[in-house]
Amino acid sequence: THLGIRLPLRSGLAGPPLGLRLPRETDEESEEPGRRGSFVEMVDNLRGKSGQGYYVEMTVGSPPQTLNILVDTGSSNFAVGAAPHPFLHRYYQRQLSSTYRDLRKGVYVPYTQGKWEGELGTDLVSIPHGPNVTVRANIAAITESDKFFINGSNWEGILGLAYAEIARPDDSLEPFFDSLVKQTHIPNIFSLQLCGAGFPLNQTEALASVGGSMIIGGIDHSLYTGRLWYTPIRREWYYEVIIVRVEINGQDLKMDCKEYNYDKSIVDSGTTNLRLPKKVFEAAVKSIKAASSTEKFPDGFWLGEQLVCWQAGTTPWNIFPVISLYLMGEVTNQSFRITILPQQYLRPVEDVATSQDDCYKFAVSQSSTGTVMGAVIMEGFYVVFDRARKRIGFAVSACHVHDEFRTAAVEGPFVTADMEDCGYNIPQTDESTLMTGRA
């Protein structure tokens, strides 16, 4: 879904890899589905041009037409620009594809701000820097849109990697990843390493930057350090998880854990920020302000609107606290925590002050549709979407941005009782799956 800050606004130059790798635990290795070890052809297959989305190169049709496609774990349609648009350098030309099949059905996707609409069809699709397969997949050919494509973003479509339940126009439209798994021997798992820049990029650097990796069919051990910790996928629609506790610099926010998941908590590569329900956001900001009180910042900064700048290289990371989210573990009454640094939740913005300054936006924001663990979270971790085992794994990313004092962390186990009570049960109505805005 495509709202103001719904799409990532980060570019992705890989940060410094961590020098030390922690020893891996063998029990967890044996449980991993899919190919193990190296997926060298898929490493570095994502780009993240200056804050406007992580995209992968794909080909569509016969002969193949190459397009850059935004990787979005928060939606379930494969949709591509299929008509001229001022912001598109290229688009899918169905008439040039001998393998295109028209489904004679339209699709209309409105958002809180903007929309796209198009015509459904199928065609042959492959990922050049992915598995060596070609599949017939559903494609929404976008013929009209408003505030969807981003000027200069360098992507021409969106790859929704979530489940059929939230596909448009309805759950009968098989998502791309389902088609891929059905038509090939590729295991039902993919993993993402999004590498945030950590510092503002000028346009030249942004165009050339490596943004990360999408590993299809397994896990690449070179992309993380330490061990993977898994949280159950609560329900297969979005990648829904359950947060059981939130801490700012180790201080518990002490809220009813249902508040953290009201009305859901999802992992979404198509959202920039860590987005929190209103009450949680207010408590978190109050706590972050208190922790960083040696300096004061305007309200507009905490609203994610104003930029704050420091002399290049002097950003006072140490005054900002770490944020920890405790996620339900795989074992009863057991949780683990993921901890991000200000290097993740202060988002670098280029071209606003002078080259002598580093400028940032606060990338934690308020949500009316639950918690969204967007790029701000994902850039700290290697995230495994283990669909086969209905779980999501987190490990410290080998490319996360950090300093000499603190790194992102994935730690556990912690004893946490009554975690099932933390999930919010959305009242079922006929329209419950028609929510389109993730603002």
Partner: antibody, heavy 120, light 108 residues
Framework: QLQLQESGPGLVKPSETLSLTCTVS??????????WGWIRQPPGKGLEWIGN???????YYNPSLRGRVTISVDTSKNQFSLKLSSVTAADTAVYYC????????????WGRGTLVTVSS | EIVLTQSPATLSLSPGERATLSCRAS??????LAWFQQKPGQAPRLLIY???NRATGIPARFSGSGSGTDFTLTISSLEPEDFAVYYC??????????FGGGTKVEIK
């Protein structure tokens, strides 16, 4: 009612250090609601921001002046100060101290200003 | 760097007339913009903040509008004491650093 008053020498020799003090009266400089700043205006020209300080001592400086400028605060005297080193004739200006209010965003209260001339 | 361009440089009007001053930012500053008035030999005075909010004690004849890159200060009916130089300043990038070059409103 809060008032700001700049003080310091009106004439400074080239290559020397310009030193000014702003005295805050009518309220504490240690209020958590404000930053305090310096702005200057060369004769017949526009306004140029120099820098800000919070009562905790946290400072922000104009990149064009960095390396030459230091702003400090003395909460016991309810004052904040400006030092600008290695001055040249281009630093001749009216120097204003001001309060950054309205949520640390806008200079909502200004001193009357003091003219500093750099000349030998 | 965000550059603020004010126009016109000089505006020659008579008392009672309407004054329209423009401030254009080189990129969006949302609504984080202020207007100041400066009379000869005096310090600047905050007139408008957040693009359209009048500061304390500012008469209703002063109004601000705009967002993004284009902003306007309007003085509905010029009083003799309104002839002065007016500056805009953006605070989208914090701390506030950029002022426009100023518009002089003079008596025709």
């Amino acid at each position: 009612q809060l008032q700001l008053q700049e003080s310091g020498p009106g004439l400074v020799k080239p290559s020397e250090t310009l030193s000014l003090t702003c005295t805050v009266s009518g309220g504490p400089i240690s209020s958590s609601s404000y930053y305090w700043g310096w702005i200057r205006q060369p004769p017949g020209k526009g306004l140029e921001w120099i820098g800000n300080i919070y009562y905790s001592g946290s400072t922000y400086y104009n990149p064009s002046l960095r390396g030459r400028v230091t702003i400090s605060v003395d909460t016991s005297k309810n004052q904040f100060s400006l030092k600008l080193s290695s001055v040249t004739a281009a630093d001749t200006a009216v120097y204003y101290c001001a309060r950054l209010g309205h949520g640390y965003n806008y200079f909502d209260l200004w001193g009357r200003g003091t003219l500093v001339t750099v000349s030998s | 760097e965000i550059v603020l361009t004010q126009s016109p440089a000089t505006l020659s009007l008579s008392p009672g007339e309407r004054a329209t001053l423009s401030c254009r930012a080189s990129q969006s500053v949302s609504s984080y913009l202020a207007w100041f008035q400066q009379k000869p030999g005096q310090a600047p005075r905050l007139l408008i903040y957040d693009a359209s909010n009048r500061a304390t004690g500012i008469p209703a004849r002063f109004s601000g509008s705009g967002s993004g890159t284009d902003f306007t200060l309007t003085i509905s009916s010029l009083e003799p004491e309104d002839f002065a130089v007016y500056y805009c300043q953006q605070v989208y990038v914090w701390p506030p650093r950029t002022f426009g070059g100023g518009t002089k409103v003079e008596i025709k």
